[in-house]
Amino acid sequence: APISSHCRLDKSNFQQPYITNRTFMLAKEASLADNNTDVRLIGEKLFHGVSMSERCYLMKQVLNFTLEEVLFPQSDRFQPYMQEVVPFLARLSNRLSTCHIEGDDLHIQRNVQKLKDTVKKLGESGEIKAIGELDLLFMSLRNACI
């Protein structure tokens, strides 16, 4: 399996009650606006064929996409949560900037691309869904990267 390096986040990032609460509140708010409950972005298909040691790198890709293509364009919505959660997630992204995989990551890119395609295909409702799954993103990052 490819070797991942610098793919670690300190546990303390996920032990801050205030920002954890705000992240989950944001996810809950967005999920109330999400009418497409049949589609899931962060689930078994995303992790399929990805070994445990590669998952932080996988989630880094998902986090970066979510920030750039979803949260920044939607930054005026779901206030006041958005203005607090986005900088927090951006800091996590920055801390994972040196997280790389040595070797073939095609299988990971394929899974991430499917998630991206689903969000793009659904348009704005795909972006809302991605925000509604920020609790899953948060927990996936925690489980994969600490």
């Epitope: 899931r40 992790f47 445990m52 927990m139 489980n143």
Partner: antibody
């Protein structure tokens, strides 16, 4: 095929400890979390916690914090659950089960291990 | 913390449809899974992510959700479907696996 095989039944005295094993086969052990779920006689299912076989990281239900220890031995693809300071109400069937992410469905279960706590 | 409520028992005649409900406070964005447990056996996953069916599970088993209630539907019920059925979610905020109390399905 994919399976989880657990150790045999145990009888313990109150205050003692028990260690149950769960041997995985048919898949890459390090790629799935191993959870422990218990079921008291005639009762429902109760989640106890998980171990990440890749890192050894753990997450325990608050109820069992300080009394349960979940470990793994990668070399033999086996996970362990040790419960200390046993009480009579710990009498239950203990199951191991696997999941992909730490919060996904339990798609494969062990056959269960009956632990009886009696003086 | 999430609490999942199931009816203790459901009875149905063979060939008919059984519906088992699972009610939860505020689990709109949680994924519901269903397990079947026959006496003396380990649970078996029959429905995951609200409505997906693992391979090997008959098409007679289906899942759905509406608001704060998830439903496991078993159509054309057979005697072999008699078992306890448990719903389960992951309470992400408290990072806990949560099971419903279980429903005993009796085939008349």
């Amino acid at each position: 095929q994919v399976q989880l095989v657990q150790s045999g039944a145990e009888v313990k005295k109150p205050g003692a400890s028990v260690k149950v094993s769960c041997k995985a086969s048919g898949y890459t052990f390090s790629d799935y979390y191993i959870h422990w779920v218990r079921q008291a006689p005639g009762q429902g299912l109760e989640w106890m916690g998980w171990v990440n076989p890749d890192t050894g990281g753990t997450r325990y239900a608050q109820k069992f914090q300080g009394r349960v220890t979940m470990t793994r031995d990668m070399s033999i693809s086996t996970a362990y659950m040790e419960l200390s300071r046993l009480r009579s109400d710990d009498t239950a069937v203990y199951y191991c089960a696997r999941d992909l992410t730490g919060f996904d469905p339990f798609d494969i279960w062990g056959q269960g291990t009956l632990v009886t706590v009696s003086s | 913390s999430s609490v999942l409520t199931q009816p203790p028992s459901v009875s149905v005649a063979p060939g008919k449809t059984a519906r088992i409900t699972c009610g939860g406070n505020n689990f709109r964005n949680k994924r519901v899974h269903w397990y079947q447990q026959k006496p003396g056996q380990a649970p078996v996953l029959v429905i995951y992510y609200d409505s997906d069916r693992p391979s090997g599970i008959p098409e007679r088993f289906s899942g759905s959700r509406s608001g704060n209630t998830a439903t496991l539907t078993i159509s054309r019920v057979e005697a072999g479907d008699e078992a306890d059925y448990y719903c389960q979610v992951w309470d992400l905020f408290n990072d806990n696996g949560v099971f419903g109390g279980g429903t005993k399905l009796t085939v008349l």
